[in-house]
């Protein structure tokens, strides 16, 4: 069938378009075009004869138009009025005619649109915006873009006037954006250049900054107010409501008690013609003196005196506060704070107690520190300690003590041997000491201020002949597995060696067994039951040797796995049960017995006379030692069978 | 139920001897460990003797050592003191005791006790 | 030997009150400690064994705790039942010693 195609169909003022013919007859004579939807000569635009190869212009013939040997129209320079419907009349050569019609519509290339709007300044909260997209064209389809995104849906949002006009009701400073209208129709769309909404708002509330209300005499101070506004506000100060300044901010340096008040900002926008105000109360406060502390006894004595220590200056209204060694108080009965904190008192002063010391003034902002104080406590003498430790020395040899207390002041010291005062140093040396130097070397500590002296006595012994040794442990019951013991020979002895026997044999080879301080000292490490020996140690020199008493060492192990005796686990009814449970364990292990799982005595033994079949279990025996810490047990399954239904039963105890 | 009565407490004179008994009934007296607590006048607990359940082991402290022996016959559900070269401090009343546990446990039943005294 | 010295000597306190008595010993004995109840005329009673636990049959009102050297007996308030003495005990093997013992009266 005849068709036409209009490419394209729709057509932009000013173009071409191309009127294609689709199954176009075979032996034509010729074709002619019209304007409109029906052959009328009166509106003929072109005529062709296939013979002749002649087009002959019609009455509607513009001089645009083109006809083609396939019988296609070309409309060039398309104007609005081109608009509508062509008409194809074919003749073929039987004379039999055939027509179809084709369209298309022109429309107009669009221009750039604007945007006019009704306000300018709209007021935030109070106005409306109403703006238009312009020029208003036909057949065009109107479109928005905000921040060159979709208009968001929003009751405040209304498209009027076929969307050609956006209307924005209560405008607020969100609505401060970037706005543009599009045109569009078929052959074109134009988008128009933004347009910013200039929504005046405010001011807000002013904040007054830093947030800080408290000063110090001396300081300056810089406020600075801020309020959102469009336009910016105008800002002006007034103090105790007197105007001072129309600034954003207010500088006073070196401000006094006298300028404590209350500070206003007020922020005002000429636009909107609205005022905000704030207030902030200032407060100044008077710089206080730099604390100081004073003392009621510069060198108290240890263990008697009391010190009170005083915070001046006394400033009524005023927190004191302490610190010792820069902590905060610790709690002790021996601190006192006097009622308003300014006054600390120390009962019975210690060594310890020395300090440093600072109070403090705390005022609204700060805390103002004294300087520290040093207490110079009198303490000691104590016991003063004779140094070498040694006891039995050599005829022959040089004898050097050296005695020491801790004491404030330090001691003064003196030497007596059984009782007579040899003299006032804190070495004694006396060279090549004989058998007569034996006897009680006394060192006296004596502490001036205090008035105090302390003693020490010491046994020195002179001799060829060393004493009997003693053996000294630091760990009477160590636990297998766990401990170790260090067992110490005594006396130290100078020119001494030192000797270890276990059982009366010489030290066996062990990583376990350490000798050290000069063989002095024999050390086991991870004792076990074996352990339990007689330890003996033996000193001696080149003339003279001794061996203390054994001592026997007590470990602490088990309990082991218990066993559970008579092994036998079949039983003839009527036989009586007696089970014996043993553990090895030092110390002797608690017992006791649970049958299927029931608790039964705390008993090393379990007997049950006359066993019946129901006496069939399990029989648990339970073992613990507290010293260890350790528990163990053991599970027997004991049956009980009918007399005579079973050989080689046991008869029972 | 458990009963422990003791019996033979009686007034002798210094350097005496004297066998106090122990009968057990109510409970496996075989299977426990036993010993012997006295109290002094003053009101002082003491304790005497132990004998295990076997009866092969036996401890004394020092005070009494050499002069008393404790013994036990598992058929007769009985213990037994014997005590000799009796001292005026040897004056209490004899409570015999049955031991959780063994030797590491304590005395976990009583008797009502036997009064033994010494005097000249 | 190992010494048990127990504290107070004696006490008087009322129906409802709460007691604690103390027993220390010169050693080391764990938690091998006994306590004692004693009426008057009556054989010792056992309350409390391995320092803590109690007796079958005595009241949730007697506890024991400690260990090593120091312990103590708590009575909840007391019963007056609860008056009489009590004895510390420790059964860390022999010789067995006892404390001298709390007489705890009604005041």
């Known amino acids: 069938k005849l068709t036409i195609e209009s490419t394209p169909f729709n057509v932009a003022e000013g173009k071409e378009v191309l009127l294609l013919v689709h199954n176009l007859p075979q032996h034509l004579f010729g074709y002619s075009w019209y304007k409109g939807e029906r052959v009328d000569g009166n509106r003929q635009i072109i005529g062709y004869v296939i013979g002749t190869q002649q087009a002959t212009p019609g009455p509607a013939y513009s001089g645009r138009e083109i006809i083609y040997p396939n019988a296609s129209l070309l409309i060039q320079n398309i104007i609005q009025n081109d608009t509508g419907f062509y008409t194809l009349h074919v003749i073929k050569s039987d004379l039999v005619n055939e027509e179809a019609t084709g369209q298309f519509r022109v429309y107009p290339e669009l221009p750039k649109p604007s945007i006019s709007s009704n306000n300018s300044k709209p007021v935030e909260d109070k106005d409306a915006v109403a703006f238009t997209c312009e020029p208003e064209t036909q057949d065009a389809t109107y479109l928005w873009w905000v921040n060159n995104q979709s208009l968001p849906v929003s009751p405040r949002l209304q498209l009027s006037n076929g969307n050609r006009t956006l209307t924005l009701f209560n405008v607020t400073r969100n609505d401060t954006a970037s706005y543009k209208c599009e045109t569009q129709n078929p052959v074109s769309a134009r988008r128009s250049d933004s347009v910013i909404l200039n929504v005046l708002y405010g001011p807000d509330a002013p904040t007054i900054s830093p947030l800080n209300t408290s000063y110090r005499s001396g300081e300056n101070l810089n406020l600075s107010c801020h309020a959102a506004s469009n336009p910016p506000a105008q800002y002006s100060w007034f103090v105790n409501g007197t105007f001072q300044q129309s600034t954003q901010e207010l500088f006073i340096p070196n401000i006094t008690v006298n300028n404590s008040g209350s500070y206003t900002c007020q922020a005002h926008n000429s636009d909107t013609g609205l005022n905000r105000t704030t207030v902030t109360t200032i407060t100044v406060y008077a710089e206080p003196p730099k604390p100081f502390i004073t003392s009621n006894n510069s060198n108290p004595v240890e263990d008697e005196d009391a010190v009170a220590l005083t915070c001046e200056p006394e400033i009524q209204n005023t927190t004191y506060l302490w610190w010792v060694n820069n902590q905060s108080l610790p709690v002790s009965p021996r601190l006192q704070l006097s009622n308003d904190n300014r006054t600390l008192t120390l009962l019975s002063v210690t060594r310890n107690d020395v300090g440093p010391y600072e109070c403090g003034i705390q005022n609204e902002l700060s805390v103002d520190h004294s300087d520290p104080v040093i207490l110079n406590v009198l303490y000691g003498p104590d016991d003063p300690t004779i140094s070498p430790s040694y006891t039995y020395y050599r005829p022959g040899v040089n004898l050097s003590l050296s005695c020491h207390a801790a004491s404030n002041p330090p001691a003064q010291y003196s030497w007596l041997i059984d009782g007579n005062i040899q003299q006032h140093t804190q070495e004694l040396f006396i060279s090549n000491i004989t058998e007569k130097n034996s006897g009680l070397y006394t060192c006296q500590a004596n502490n001036s201020a205090s008035g105090h002296s302390r003693t020490t006595v010491k046994t020195i012994t002179v001799s060829a002949e060393l004493p009997k040794p003693s053996i000294s442990s630091n760990n009477s019951k160590p636990v297998e597995d766990k401990d170790a013991v260090a067992f110490t020979c005594e006396p130290e002895a100078q020119n001494t060696t030192y000797l270890w026997w276990v059982n009366g044999q010489s030290l066996p080879v062990s990583p376990r067994l350490q000798l050290s301080n000069g063989n002095r000292t024999l050390t086991l490490f991870n004792v076990t039951r074996n352990d339990a020996r007689a330890y003996v140690c033996g000193i001696q020199n080149s003339v003279s040797a001794n061996r203390s008493d054994p001592v026997t060492l007590d470990v602490l192990y088990g309990p082991d796995t218990p066993i559970i005796s008579p092994p036998d686990s079949s039983y003839l009814s009527g036989a009586n049960l007696n089970l014996s449970c043993h553990s090895a364990s030092n110390p002797s292990p608690q017992y006791s017995w649970r049958i299927n799982g029931i608790p039964q005595q705390h008993t090393q033994v379990l007997f049950i006379a006359k066993i019946t079949p129901n006496n069939n279990g399990t029989y648990a025996c339970f073992v613990s030692n507290l010293a260890t810490g350790r528990n163990n047990s053991i599970v027997k399954s004991i049956t009980v069978s009918a007399s005579g239904t079973s050989p080689g039963l046991s008869a029972g105890a | 139920e458990l009963q422990l009565v003791e019996s033979g407490g009686v007034l002798v004179k210094p350097g005496g001897s004297l066998k106090l008994s122990c009968a057990a009934s109510g409970f496996a007296f075989s299977s426990y460990d036993m010993s012997w607590v006295r109290q002094t006048p003053e009101k002082r607990l003491e304790w005497v003797t132990y004998?295990?359940?076997?009866?092969?082991?036996?401890y004394y402290p020092d005070t009494v050592k050499g002069r008393f022996t404790i013994s036990r016959d598992n058929a007769r559900n009985t213990l037994y003191l014997q005590m000799s070269s009796l001292k005026s401090e040897d004056t209490a009343i004899y409570y015999c005791?049955?031991?959780?546990?063994?030797?590491?446990?304590?005395?976990?039943?009583w008797g009502q006790g036997t009064l033994v005294t010494v005097s000249a | 030997d190992i010494q048990m010295t127990q504290s107070p000597a004696s006490l008087s306190a009322s129906v409802g009150e709460t007691v604690t008595i103390t027993c220390r010993a010169s050693e080391n004995i764990y938690s091998y400690l006994a306590w004692y109840q004693q009426k008057q005329g009556k054989s010792p009673q056992l309350l409390v064994y391995?320092?803590?636990t109690l007796t079958e049959g005595v009241p949730s009102r007697f506890s024991g705790s400690g260990s090593g050297t120091q312990f103590s007996l708590k009575i909840n308030s007391l019963q007056p039942e609860d008056f009489g003495s009590y004895y510390c005990?420790?059964?860390?093997?022999?010789?067995?010693?006892f404390g001298s013992g709390t007489k705890l009266e009604i005041k």
């Open positions: 004998i295990n359940s076997g009866g092969g082991i036996t």
């Open positions: 005791t049955a031991h959780y546990f063994g030797s590491s446990g304590p005395f976990a039943y």
């Open positions: 391995n320092a803590k």
């Open positions: 005990q420790h059964h860390y093997g022999t010789p067995f010693t």
